[in-house]
């Protein structure tokens, strides 16, 4: 009779996390008599998965009735697969021996790869705001996926970005993987309403990619433009001067009026007008009593925006 | 080299409807060269499931790359399994020939059984009502399940019944099965609120049986008991006689008073009193003017309940 062969027909099996994995194994002969065992891995550190003879293996069921005398099928099913179950599984025939059974022949092994979905991508932006024309970095992270192959793209308002760098870790074999990508985005004044999107495609997602988003409103500071103008006189001896603060973001803004360098009034912007692009406008006015001045007066509108260094605009009021 | 063997390790595979079925097949040798095919069934009428050489098989995917020169694994996966896919699948090796390839060797076959859930059980009762102490039949039907093994139990108010007969059709092999069970239930006067339950356990239900119910209120008729009594006189020359109609079900009831066999009044029961057991009570009274009678009067309370033959109770009123 031909010597027993251990047939593991599948070189590899791929299973989605949470499903059951069936690992096929067949013998070509009933002899020599002795049990079979399934191991994950080879060599001294191999892990026992199933022992026909003894032990409790709650996640393992046999496809056939292994107690039947003429059984040649030693396929098993492992329930509730997780990425930690990935590896090469060997069906090993033992012959009876004493004091212990003796390993007789091993199958070629079946590599079990576990398809695990990536976690929802988390996109984070810069710690401090930057102004238009500057470049800021966004990162996108996701974990726990398998296999390693994954595609990541960046978009800004639907337009694909090209300036990014992606790493998948670890570089070698692992039960699951993580991805980390950094995209560099050049800010423009109109970016308050803009959004960056990190999009990931993976075999487990069946063509329905995962997306993580971040709003550029968290990353951008648009400094205001100032314009000081004199309005028509409301009354004799009274000048009305306005400071138009335009196109700033975010909201936080403090304005100080100075008359010839001396602080006249300080106020915090409250009722703002929002522009279509998401920036804000605000106007402040100062009534100057010209009776109190013999000479010309220099009025200065000084604005501190979002904790930055103050900017100012002056206006020379002629006393006629 | 040993002659090629076709190894189908699993004698049987069981798959839930809607899932994919993996059918394992391995060759022990690369020669003779030639394609493999998968068939369902054997003999002249066998059905081609997959042909490695040619054809379009949208539901079939191969586990391995069959185009690789040294491939010995010819396992396939069939998607979206339905009960109609049940059967024995054979992996068949052909050797190249002219004009046609020649069948060389077949695997032993893998029987694919499809686990399909039974439909929700429908319980129906008798077409006509029956009275207590009589036996009525209830039927329970369910369809579309597989495998054939199924357990059906009957309960009345939580107590298991033993007098029933169950058939699973067809008797022979089939892609799916139907069950029909008839239970015989002895009615009691207190059964208006009773319920019969048909409970089915099947491997696909994971220990959570399906139940169908029917209310015995649809099947039972509890005939009334009648009691005619004379009440104390309200006024001289006037006798008050009541007819107490007790413990009947269903509601429909018509009562006729007769004086010495002549119809005095007919009325339909409306405002009923419901008892705890679901039956109803009703009372009717008749005022008899004794001046109009010289001799004794026989008063009869005649009740027609639920379209059945009338029952009556008489009372002799003495004219003093």
């Amino acid at each position: 009779e031909d010597e027993l062969q251990v047939i593991q027909p599948e070189k590899s099996v791929s299973v989605a996390a949470g499903e059951s994995a069936t690992l096929c194994c067949a013998m070509t002969s009933l002899i020599p008599v002795g049990p079979i065992m399934w191991f994950r891995g080879a060599g001294a550190g191999r892990e026992l998965i199933y022992n026909q003879k003894e032990g409790h293996f709650p996640r393992v069921t046999t496809v056939s009735e292994l107690t039947k005398r003429n059984n040649l099928d030693f396929s098993i099913s492992i329930s509730n697969i997780t990425p930690a179950d990935a590896g090469t599984y060997y069906c090993v025939k033992f012959r009876k021996g004493s004091p212990d059974d003796v390993e007789f022949k091993s199958g070629a092994g079946t590599e079990l790869s576990v398809r695990a979905k990536p976690s929802a991508p988390v996109v984070s932006g810069p710690a401090v705001r930057a102004t238009p024309e500057h470049t800021v970095s966004f990162t996108c992270e996701s974990h726990g996926f398998s296999p390693r192959d994954i595609t990541l793209k960046w978009f800004k308002n639907g337009n694909e970005l090209s300036d990014f760098q992606t790493n998948v870790d670890p570089a070698g074999d692992s039960v699951s993987y993580s991805i980390h990508s950094t995209a560099r985005v050049v800010l423009t004044r109109g970016d308050v309403h803009s959004q960056v999107i990190c999009e990931m495609a993976h075999i487990t997602l069946q063509g329905d990619p995962l997306r993580g988003t971040a709003n550029l409103s968290e990353a951008i500071r648009v400094p205001p433009t100032l314009e000081v103008t004199q309005q028509p006189m409301r009354a004799e001896n009274q000048a009305n001067v306005t400071c138009q603060v335009s196109n700033f973001y975010p909201r936080g803004l403090q304005l100080t009026w100075l008359e010839n360098g001396n602080v006249s009034r300080t106020e915090t912007a409250s009722t703002l007008i929002e522009n279509k692009d998401g920036t804000y406008n605000w106007m402040s006015w100062l009534l100057v009593n010209t009776c109190a001045h013999r000479d010309d007066v220099v009025l200065t509108c000084q604005v501190e925006h979002d904790g930055q260094q103050a900017v100012s605009k002056s206006y020379a009021l002629e006393i006629s | 080299e040993d002659e090629l063997q076709v190894i189908q390790p699993e004698k049987s595979v069981s798959v839930a409807a809607g899932e994919s079925a993996t059918l394992c097949c391995a060759m022990t040798s690369l020669i003779p060269v030639g394609p493999i095919m998968w068939f369902r069934g054997a003999g002249a009428g066998r059905e081609l499931i997959y042909n490695q050489k040619e054809g379009h098989f949208p539901r079939v995917t191969t586990v391995s790359e069959l185009t690789k020169r040294n491939n010995l694994d010819f396992s396939i996966s069939i998607s979206n399994i339905t009960p109609a896919d049940a059967g024995t699948y054979y992996c068949v090796k052909f050797r190249k020939g002219s004009p046609d390839d020649v069948e060389f060797k077949s695997g032993a076959g893998t029987e694919l059984s499809v686990r399909a859930k039974p439909s929700a059980p429908v319980v129906s009762g008798p077409a006509v009502r029956a009275t207590p102490e009589h036996t009525v039949s209830f039927t329970c039907e369910s369809h579309g399940f597989s495998p054939r093994d199924i357990t059906l139990k009957w309960f009345k108010n939580g107590n298991e019944l033993s007098d029933f007969q169950t058939n699973v059709d067809p008797a022979g092999d089939s892609v799916s099965y139907s069950i029909h069970s008839t239970a015989r239930v002895v009615l009691t006067r207190g059964d208006v609120h009773s319920q019969v339950i048909c409970e089915m356990a099947h491997i696909t239900l994971q220990g959570d049986p399906l139940r169908g119910t029917a209310n015995l209120s649809e099947a039972i008729r509890v005939p009334p008991t009648l009691e005619v009594t004379q009440q104390p006189m309200r006024a001289e020359n006037q006798a008050n006689v009541t007819c107490q109609v007790s413990n009947f079900y269903p509601r429909g009831l018509q009562l006729t008073w007769l004086e010495n066999g002549n119809v005095s009044r007919t009325e339909t029961a409306s405002t009923l009193i419901e008892n705890k057991d679901g039956t109803y009570n009703w009372m009717s009274w008749l005022l008899v003017n004794t001046c109009a009678h010289r001799d004794d009067v026989v008063l009869t309370c005649q009740v027609e309940h639920d379209g059945q033959q009338a029952v009556s109770k008489s009372y002799a009123l003495e004219i003093s």
Epitope: E1, L30, I31, V33, L66, T67, R95, S98, V102 | -
Partner: antibody, heavy 120, light 107 residues
């Protein structure tokens, strides 16, 4: 056909040795183990030991350790059981049995038995 | 060593009777139990292996059940040729041990 043929009855004196043979035919001898089981007159079955016909490993019952030796000759598909220092309570029918379980031990094929009588 | 206790030691029954023999192991042996039939002057014959599997060629009136420590051999309808002694045997580990036997006699 598949069978185990044992050697004939033996009469031995106390202190002597006996060697019983068991020839297998009709199956691959090396694929199975052989156990030896004895049965004293009117008594039950007593397992004596086991030998692998493939690798020659043995396992003996504790009470017979040192007195019993089991061997095989794969060229003739024969198993042997030698029992030394015989005593009168060794009088029994000695059976060889093919052990056929894969992960357990049971005996699906038996020889007809060899009667060994120990008497002075 | 694993002790095997068989009961009853003998049973008297008639043709057509249902006969049940029990066997208890002193420790758990999974399903690794066999049942044998022995007639006078003959070698034992394997009836049941792995607690419940019918050996090829054995009539279906013989059946086995149990796992762990308690096992049963049932003869559903006793036939004339079934009058014999029955032994259980644990095959879980060395040393292999047999029960004391149950003699099924004609009533």
């Amino acid at each position: 056909q598949v069978q185990l043929v044992q050697s004939g009855a033996e009469v031995k004196k106390p202190g002597a040795s006996v060697k019983v043979s068991c020839k297998a035919s009709g199956y691959t001898f090396g694929g199975y183990g052989i156990s030896w089981v004895r049965q004293a007159p009117g008594q039950g079955l007593e397992w004596m030991g086991w030998i692998s016909a493939y690798g020659g490993e043995t396992n003996y019952a504790q009470k017979l350790q040192g007195r019993v030796t089991m061997t095989t000759d794969t060229s003739t598909s024969t198993a042997y059981m030698e029992l030394r220092s015989l005593r009168s309570d060794d009088t029994a029918v000695y059976y060889c049995a093919r052990e056929a379980g894969s992960s357990w031990y049971d005996f699906d094929l038996w020889g007809r038995g060899t009667l060994v009588t120990v008497s002075s | 060593d694993i002790q095997m206790t068989q009961s009853p030691s003998s049973v008297s029954a008639s043709v057509g009777d249902r006969v049940t023999i029990t066997c208890r192991a002193s420790q758990g042996i999974s399903s690794w139990l066999a049942w044998y039939q022995q007639k006078p002057g003959k070698a034992p014959k394997l009836l049941i292996y792995a607690a419940s599997n019918l050996q090829s060629g054995v009539p279906s009136r013989f059946s086995g059940s149990g796992s762990g420590t308690d096992f049963t051999l049932t003869i559903s309808s006793l036939q004339p040729e079934d009058f014999a002694t029955y032994y259980c045997q644990q095959g879980a580990s060395f040393p292999i041990t047999f029960g004391g036997g149950t003699k099924v006699e004609i009533k």
